[in-house]
């Protein structure tokens, strides 16, 4: 979506399908103030942008409110009436969805299933992460809904755990974005911890009988 | 492997519309990509149609626009093109094809020439 | 609208040549820019994407470059294959072709 144009870069972000954030870097006009004009439907008349996005003191990108649309956004940023560059991109190509909420664990024994509010729209994939101290990488598992379960834990580690959700590629296409992280929560024997120990507690000596 | 196989009557009259259908195979119709329409007027070059995403968003050819119907039928895994008021200048080979993501129009039929004439 | 001009509208080689073809913008398109081959009854044949992404399967001859509003195809040793009319397509806003360039043999 970036590439120059003209000294031109752009970047779009759809969020959560409600809101559409298009910025530009435009190093040639670094000190103007360009214009932001659009429309959702190519037989409109070109809107201005009304809520522009500022860099020390000079626009540098526009936000839109385009709540669940599957439109094509036709743009065009301007230096005065001249077209500085000129594009129309489908917005779902530029989805992030938004972090997920009301996320939730349920234990049984050596598996957790995590679970968490799924969003309005489909096609999405929803990713846990999880590690404990004596993991050197995040192991992940993601399923279709927020109702994820991961087995063969060990219950007496620590684990930290975080979810987000990203769009199937092969709907949304590649320049998706996935979303923030939900906040990092830990657990150890079924219970939630503040934290789990940087480095991993040694194991307890067996008590001889 | 993606096939496209265009479909409809090689022979329209003046004023009429036309019409022609996409058939996809080896590949689902709902996915991100673009189905699209494309022609080739005799002794000419290439003229992009315009093209449509399996929810039915469209997006066509401004010169053409008032003129032409893009639809798509996802049950039956095909798209359709409708041209309407249609003169000699609109006889041309009709192709589809695939415009997969920002890479350009990567599968495509094997084009069905469309004469327009009494 | 974004019109495509491409030079030369014909060019005569023969096999072995090093080719080279432009394309023009009439306003910016960043690298959203693709290029076919095209031979007579047949479907058009994409080459390159994204001004200088070489296809899958498509032979390391072709090369593409360019960003903005200039373009190159580059065929660095023609093959008999290769005599065919080539189109430069923008599908950064909404679609344009070029008018083409026939290449044909010497």
């Known amino acids: 979506q970036g590439g120059a144009a003209e000294g031109v870069q752009i970047q779009i972000i759809y969020f959560n399908l409600e809101t559409v954030q298009v910025t530009w870097n435009a190093s040639k006009y670094s000190r103007t103030n360009l214009t932001f004009h659009y429309r959702f439907n190519g037989d409109e008349a070109y809107d201005q942008c009304t809520n522009y996005l500022l860099q020390e003191g000079h626009t540098s990108g526009c936000l839109l409110d385009a709540e669940q649309r599957d439109d094509i956004l036709y743009f065009s940023i301007r230096n005065g009436t001249h077209p500085v560059f000129t594009a129309s991109r489908w917005m779902v190509y530029y989805l992030k969805p938004s972090s997920p909420k009301h996320v939730r664990f349920s234990w049984h024994q050596d598996a957790v299933t995590v679970t968490c509010s799924d969003l309005s729209y489909g096609d999405l994939l929803y990713e846990v992460q999880y590690r404990s101290p004596f993991d050197t990488e995040w192991q992940s598992k993601q399923e279709n809904t927020c109702n994820v379960t991961i087995e063969g834990l060990d219950a007496e580690k620590c684990y930290s755990f975080w979810v987000r959700v990203k769009a199937m590629e092969d709907v949304y296409g590649p320049d998706t974005y996935p979303s923030d992280w939900s906040e990092v929560t830990c657990w150890q024997r079924g219970e939630i911890r503040d934290a789990c120990a940087e480095t991993p507690t040694p194991p307890k000596p067996k008590l001889s009988k | 492997q993606v096939q496209l196989q265009e479909s409809g009557p090689g022979l329209v009259k003046p004023s009429g519309t036309l019409s022609l259908t996409c058939a996809v195979s080896g590949g689902s119709i709902r996915s991100s990509n673009w189905w699209s329409w494309v022609r080739q007027p005799p002794g000419k070059g290439l003229e992009w149609i315009g093209e449509i995403y399996h929810g039915g968003t469209t997006n066509n050819n401004p010169s053409l626009k008032s003129r032409v119907t893009i639809s798509v039928d996802q049950s039956k895994s095909q798209f359709s093109l409708k041209l309407s008021s249609v003169t000699a200048a609109d006889t041309a080979v009709y192709y589809c094809a695939r415009h997969r993501y920002s890479s350009g129009l990567d599968y495509w039929g094997q084009g069905t020439l469309v004469t327009v004439s009494s | 609208d974004i019109q495509m001009t491409q030079t030369p509208s014909t060019l005569s080689a023969s096999v072995g040549d090093r080719v080279t073809i432009t394309c023009r913008g009439s306003h910016s398109i960043s690298n959203w820019l693709g290029w076919y081959r095209h031979k007579p009854r047949k479907a058009p044949n994409l080459l390159i994407y994204k001004a200088s992404s070489l296809k899958s399967g498509v032979p390391s001859r072709f090369s593409g470059s360019g960003s903005g509003t200039e373009f190159t195809l580059t065929i660095t040793s023609l093959q008999p294959d290769d005599f065919a009319t080539y189109y430069c397509?923008?599908?950064?806003?909404?679609?344009?072709f070029g008018q083409g360039t026939k290449v044909d043999i010497k």
């Open positions: 397509q923008q599908y950064n806003h909404y679609s344009t």
